[in-house]
Amino acid sequence: KSPIFGPEEVNSVEGNSVSITCYYPPTSVNRHTRKYWCRQGARGGCITLISSEGYVSSKYAGRANLTNFPENGTFVVNIAQLSQDDSGRYKCGLGINSRGLSFDVSLEVSQGPGLLNDTKVYTVDLGRTVTINCPFKTENAQKRKSLYKQIGLYPVLVIDSSGYVNPNYTGRIRLDIQGTGQLLFSVVINQLRLSDAGQYLCQAGDDSNSNKKNADLQVLKPEPELVYEDLRGSVTFHCALGPEVANVAKFLCRQSSGENCDVVVNTLGKRAPAFEGRILLNPQDKDGSFSVVITGLRKEDAGRYLCGAHSDGQLQEGSPIQAWQLFVNEESTIPRSPTVVKGVAGGSVAVLCPYNRKESKSIKYWCLWEGAQNGRCPLLVDSEGWVKAQYEGRLSLLEEPGNGTFTVILNQLTSRDAGFYWCLTNGDTLWRTTVEIKIIEGEPNLKVPGNVTAVLGETLKVPCHFPCKFSSYEKYWCKWNNTGCQALPSQDEGPSKAFVNCDENSRLVSLTLNLVTRADEGWYWCGVKQGHFYGETAAVYVAVEERKAAGSRDVSLAKADAAPDEKVLDSGFREIENKAIQDPRLFAEEKAVADTRDQADGSRASVDSGSSEEQGGSSR
């Protein structure tokens, strides 16, 4: 008995599509072996029509595809534009056609429903609009026009020219009589429901001379598009519902049990808590299309998603919809990285961001997710040397450790830094990841003075105190600039006196600037790292002033000034809206944007994602 399973019979109609799913035991060998769909011949052979190795028969060119879903142990054969010639016996299988790891499928394509003569067939998607055209002769121009639906043996009136509308069609049907030149009336039905499908009869006049026209309305429920993405990666649902719903509220919902479709996000401002920090609904185009990006995919995100349009912002009967079946591959190529990073006020965090290692030359970005309206993610820093003005001196994106990971360091933390941040590149859009920064109680581990003033031409020594917990770490000083933090020589001055209950392993490491120049003004960081993995940092701003009295300056913690005031918003920054996030290749064009203003940073509430993958600011 073959372990392959599938539909034994498939019945369809000419012109339609079928989507045949074949199930196989998801062993390692089966997942990677050839998948095929073949047609059985009269003499017992089976001629391959399409396979997972790229072969497509000329009979199927341009109308069929085969997609393997190894995580689920399924593959799907889609065949479009069916004709009666496609009727026959087929096999879906694994390996070699003649080897028995297969399942027999009977495909029967019929001519379509038994239609009355002169019947016009209308095939329309659920939620869309149909226009049924009804011609008539001159003698019936002034007579009553009507549309009936055949229910069982009886025609039931749907609408007529005297103003009657069947209650099932209220608010979504109209009868239009064309100008005097055209002997035609039409019935327009909006927000089509599955129950609208059936045989219709339009009629002009009521006597034996009346004109009649038969119509067959087929309402198609959209086949879900199969989407297969990696755990921890991202997915984009592109939703094109047509210009007729351009001004109607849009939604994305996820089907739960039964009829329910729980709103994930909509344009009325609703967003499911489970997607906080990891979803963007991109602004819609004039044609009513929009897209939704979800990052940090979880196992439980798998399921059927519908996008649609309805004034309520949720699925209702007659909503035009598009459907996807999302599978989340747990054998992910995207490595685990912490989804929550914790830091203390005044301290720092170092965030590791994965990217596709095949795209080491891609531009790396870090943005701050904002939940207002439909969500947006303004950029804060990139790997090309741009940093948002109000983050100068406290934010750096480093290409290290490389080989599929970059590092973002943010210091001088305040409660306003709590929130969700996205790591992304201008390459593989599936490698967008989300991290939540939480600000917790505690003191920064590294101790440095506040503002420091150096004197031109003199020597300046700035201390950084490292507690004993960092005894095994490499300690460094560097000068911050837009492209990173350039390492500087520093001196180990022995154990620090700045820590209570800390033994000889604490350290005081000083930065010395000899013969200070104007170029020395700026932000300096001291920090710890292990190899290419960065830990905590602390920042000091060094101002340079004219000489007042001779000598050198040795700054202690006690003599340090207060921290500098927060910088005023600068007009030279750019904000990347959702559109750019959707296609990071647009980032480059945004760089030139000037004289825009960000909304003033409000405090952002932190929402716990419930993840166990947490990391403290000092760990990696």
């Epitope: 399973f5 539909p7 034994e8 019979e9 498939v10 019945n11 369809s12 109609v13 339609n16 599509s17 079928v18 989507s19 045949i20 199930y23 689920n72 399924t74 379509g112 429903p113 095939t123 429901r193 599955l194 129950s195 087929q218 309402v219 198609l220 429920k221 086949e223 089907q255 049990s257 039964g258 009829e259 399921g303 059927r304 009967e317 079946q325």
Partner: nanobody, 126 residues
Framework: EVQLVESGGGLVQAGDSLRLSCAAS????????MGWFRQAPGKEREFVTT??????????YYADSVKGRFTISRDNAKNTAYLQMNSLKPDDTAVYYC?????????????????WGQGTQVTVSS
């Protein structure tokens, strides 16, 4: 909610035929598949057959044990699924349950179905 009511069960002789019906009512608009499962005393509930649809296309799935003997069909207008059982065997004795689903990843898996009927007893005597 969708309500499912099975009918047509009963006591028959081996080799006889029986036709089960499953009438769906309520919000059947988004149902995507209807199927039959059975449960013999002291055994797990097992897949028998399922029919799924999309527009005018139907897909019929059968368990190996009933292939060639059982046929599933549906009447869209009546929101009813039928199970025609021919050449019945004593092994077919069980409570037969009708199930409906809005999303089916694998039609053989009971947990993929959202709605269930109360069941109808089929007894095949030798």
């Amino acid at each position: 909610e969708v309500q499912l009511v099975e009918s047509g069960g009963g006591l028959v002789q081996a080799g006889d035929s029986l036709r089960l019906s499953c009438a769906a009512s309520g919000r059947t608009r988004t149902t995507y598949g209807m199927g039959w499962f059975r449960q013999a005393p002291g055994k797990e509930r097992e897949f028998v057959t399922t029919i799924t649809w999309s527009g005018p296309t139907n897909y019929k799935y059968y368990a190996d044990s009933v292939k060639g003997r059982f046929t599933i069909s549906r009447d869209n207008a009546k929101n009813t699924a039928y199970l025609q059982m021919n050449s019945l065997k004593p092994d077919d004795t069980a409570v037969y349950y009708c199930a409906a689903s809005t999303v089916l990843t694998d039609p053989r898996v009971p947990t993929e179905y959202d709605y269930w009927g109360q069941g109808t007893q089929v007894t095949v005597s030798s």
